[in-house]
Amino acid sequence: LPAQVAFTPYAPEPGGTCRLREYYDQTAQMCCSKCPPGQHAKVFCTKTSDTVCDSCEDSTYTQLWNWVPECLSCGSRCSSDQVETQACTREQNRICTCRPGWYCALSKQEGCRLCAQLRKCRPGFGVARPGTETSDVVCKPCAPGTFSNTTSSTDICRPHQICHVVAIPGNASMDAVCTSTSPTRSMAPGAVHLPQPVSTRSQHTQPTPAPSTAPGTSFLLPVGPSPPAEGSTGD
């Protein structure tokens, strides 16, 4: 390796490599400085002059040390079913994630390309597996002795109340109705609602509004109607 006193640009020793945050320029045949995140190479190095870097321009970014001639364009603004969890800055791309009540049906390297609304379990069905950032709700029929009378993406099947005297017996979509005396429960009802999936991404306290860009095709497409799964509703 060259001595620490070598300043860029310099010729590496035969078989040697360039140092950290340097790159080998094939044209100049020299080790030259990379540009830091948030900048790009405005002028490439020569045998006698080092790389000239410039800040990334409007709505563009570089996340790594680089020698690219142009910064990368930030993705298009988030669609209506998404929230911007990371703003476009000189050093990072915009990240769009699905808003509450939706999940990511088609992910991309960072954030989500396509959001879909979480399935709602119809009366007689409860949530077997709650939705997450990347998976839909799974519904199951309420077992005997349990019911769900809501159309919800969070409600589980609850136990029927136990009556001393039953007025109307319960079924999968309706609780039992008791006469006069106070009812008791067959078991503690526990948590009736499952929480909405919580994003694991840290939210910016003040997300910067998305830059306006020329209209173009968005990758963040709205979801078209699809046949409801068993026990679910398309609402």
Epitope: A210, P211, S212
Partner: antibody, heavy 117, light 106 residues
Framework: EVQLQQSGAELVKPGASVKISCKAS????????MDWVKQSHGKSLEWIGD????????SYNQKFKGKATLTVDKSSSTAYMEVRSLTSEDTAVFYC??????????WGAGTTVTVSS | ENVLTQSPAIMSASLGEKVTMSCRAS?????MYWYQQKSDASPKLWIY???NLAPGVPARFSGSGSGNSYSLTISSMEGEDAATYYC?????????FGGGTKLELK
Amino acid sequence: EVQLQQSGAELVKPGASVKISCKASGYTFTDYNMDWVKQSHGKSLEWIGDINPNYESTSYNQKFKGKATLTVDKSSSTAYMEVRSLTSEDTAVFYCARDKGWYFDVWGAGTTVTVSS
Amino acid sequence: ENVLTQSPAIMSASLGEKVTMSCRASSSVKNMYWYQQKSDASPKLWIYYTSNLAPGVPARFSGSGSGNSYSLTISSMEGEDAATYYCQQFTSSPYTFGGGTKLELK
């Protein structure tokens, strides 16, 4: 509260240099670029350049390359701009401004530099 | 460099009057940014990303435009709006400002 405190007015002789400071407070200094802007009396604004305090990397308006040098002292959250070989053309108010991405959301009060013999 | 031309250079408006000032770029820009400056004061961010109002800017202000042509509009002039307004672009280096539009109260 985010604030940029600039050093006081300077009266300097032609050919001399001047170093203006801009002390940042109320935010993490290394999170945003610091830009410098020149405003000659009764005239518009001219962008001089910016500095990324994290990497101490700079970007200049070609017009000010060799005229202005931008530096930072991370330990004191202070940005500096040195202007050299001063002439009457350099008589102006110089502002530091926090670069929020692609706009200057907070500005210093400005430092007036008067070049006169 | 991308030259921004603001027009008119000076204008006056009566209270309640609608005001529109323009900023034309010699090359197309992605977004336009506007600053308000009153005499002997620092510029203040006024509009960013073409149409977003900076915190504290009254809703009577709006920004619009695309490509080479942008504008700042005040729906109903108020006394405190008298100031010089500068446009700025960040699409190409060097980042440039317009020459300013000085808005006076008639």
